[in-house]
């Protein structure tokens, strides 16, 4: 059977006026997954995103990540979109510098 990913979005200062937002998916099976940043619901172009490899996490499941740089103050326009085994979810950028809670999706 399939194991849905836990999705976690974090933010960090990149440079003056910019922040890097990172979306991590972990503990999912099988390994096929779509993870992408969207602006106003539209996927960002590939050249503005950085992806990590889909790697085993040691529990028979997998993990991966995608990151992009955005302008501070525009966070509300951006979401991380995840699709896995026929299910999907959308994840906002957290406010401030705090980590976003993990969300398990079924």
């Amino acid at each position: 059977g399939s194991v849905p990913p836990m999705v976690n979005v974090t933010r960090s200062e990149a440079s003056e006026g910019n922040i890097t937002v990172t979306c991590r998916a972990s503990s999912f099976y099988p390994r096929n997954i779509t993870l992408t940043w969207r602006q106003d619901g539209v996927s960002l172009s590939h050249d503005t995103q950085q992806w990590g490899d889909v790697l085993p996490d040691g529990n028979g499941t997998y993990q991966t990540w995608v990151a992009t740089r955005i302008c501070q103050g525009e966070e509300q326009r951006f979401t991380c979109y995840m699709e896995h085994s026929g299910n999907h979810s959308t994840h906002p950028v957290p406010s401030g510098n705090s980590h976003h809670h993990h969300h398990h999706h079924h």
Epitope: R38, Q39, D40, G41, V42, S45, T79, E83, H88, T90
Partner: antibody, heavy 118, light 108 residues
Framework: EIQLVQSGAEVKKPGSSVKVSCKPS????????IYWVRQAPGQGLEWIGY????????IYNQQFKDRATLTVDKSTSTAYMELSSLRSEDTAVYYC???????????WGQGTLVTVSS | EIVLTQSPATLSLSPGERATLSCSAS???????LHWYQQKPGQSPRLLIY???NLASGVPARFSGSGSGTDYTLTISSLEPEDFAVYYC?????????FGQGTKVEIK
């Protein structure tokens, strides 16, 4: 086949409100944003706002922020746009549209004509 | 707000002729955020070209798009009778999302 079906034409009095519905089909309702756009007779296209049906986030064009209300009913996979304090210049065709993978508006509803007249 | 100015407002041409439509932005925008739509009388707009130069599904190859920065162009290499319509450019780079005022391509 992806379709967005909107409610029928409305005639409203100045000062009243109108609520237009949009029911998409052919894809997972919560996977794409729903945008609203209007077009006055013989005029161009004007973006009102959008809603992310999955998380409920709404982004408005500031010009409509005080009068437009966007909502979704996930149980019926339907999106709504309500416009209050109607005036004659709100007479227009109101469209819903779906955000696309690579563009803001990839599929459109058939439009709903709202006529504001005393 | 980014203002998109389309020119000309009306283009009168005959079938078989080449149509060149311009869209000028008040501020520079990434080519990833410039799209074109076609609208025929009594119909909803239809996505024609996305991200400056990519044809939407089902759009004939006689349509093409180009441009960068503040200047973008939609070209119809040889007009067919069904191409006579209004064309809108639209930017998604900054809020509010905006459209040009449209160029009407009419039969001469």
């Amino acid at each position: 086949e992806i379709q967005l079906v909107q409610s029928g034409a409305e005639v409203k009095k100045p000062g009243s409100s109108v609520k237009v519905s949009c029911k998409p089909s052919g894809y997972a309702f919560t996977s794409n944003n729903i945008y609203w756009v209007r077009q006055a007779p013989g005029q161009g296209l004007e973006w009102i706002g959008y809603i992310d049906p999955y998380i409920g986030r709404i982004i408005y064009n500031q010009q409509f922020k005080d009068r437009a209300t966007l909502t979704v009913d996930k149980s019926t996979s339907t999106a709504y746009m309500e416009l209050s304090s109607l005036r004659s210049e709100d007479t227009a065709v109101y469209y819903c549209s779906r955000s696309g993978e690579r563009s803001n508006f990839d599929y459109w509803g058939q439009g709903t004509l709202v006529t504001v007249s005393s | 707000e980014i203002v998109l100015t389309q020119s000309p407002a009306t283009l009168s041409l005959s079938p078989g002729e080449r149509a060149t439509l311009s869209c000028s932005a008040s501020s520079s925008i990434s080519s990833n955020y410039l799209h074109w739509y076609q609208q025929k009388p009594g119909q909803s707009p239809r996505l024609l070209i996305y991200r400056t130069s990519n044809l939407a599904s089902g759009v004939p190859a006689r349509f093409s798009g180009s441009g960068s920065g503040t200047d973008y162009t939609l070209t119809i290499s040889s007009l067919e009778p069904e191409d006579f319509a209004v064309y809108y450019c639209q930017q998604g780079g900054s809020l509010p999302l905006t459209f040009g005022q449209g160029t009407k391509v009419e039969i001469k």
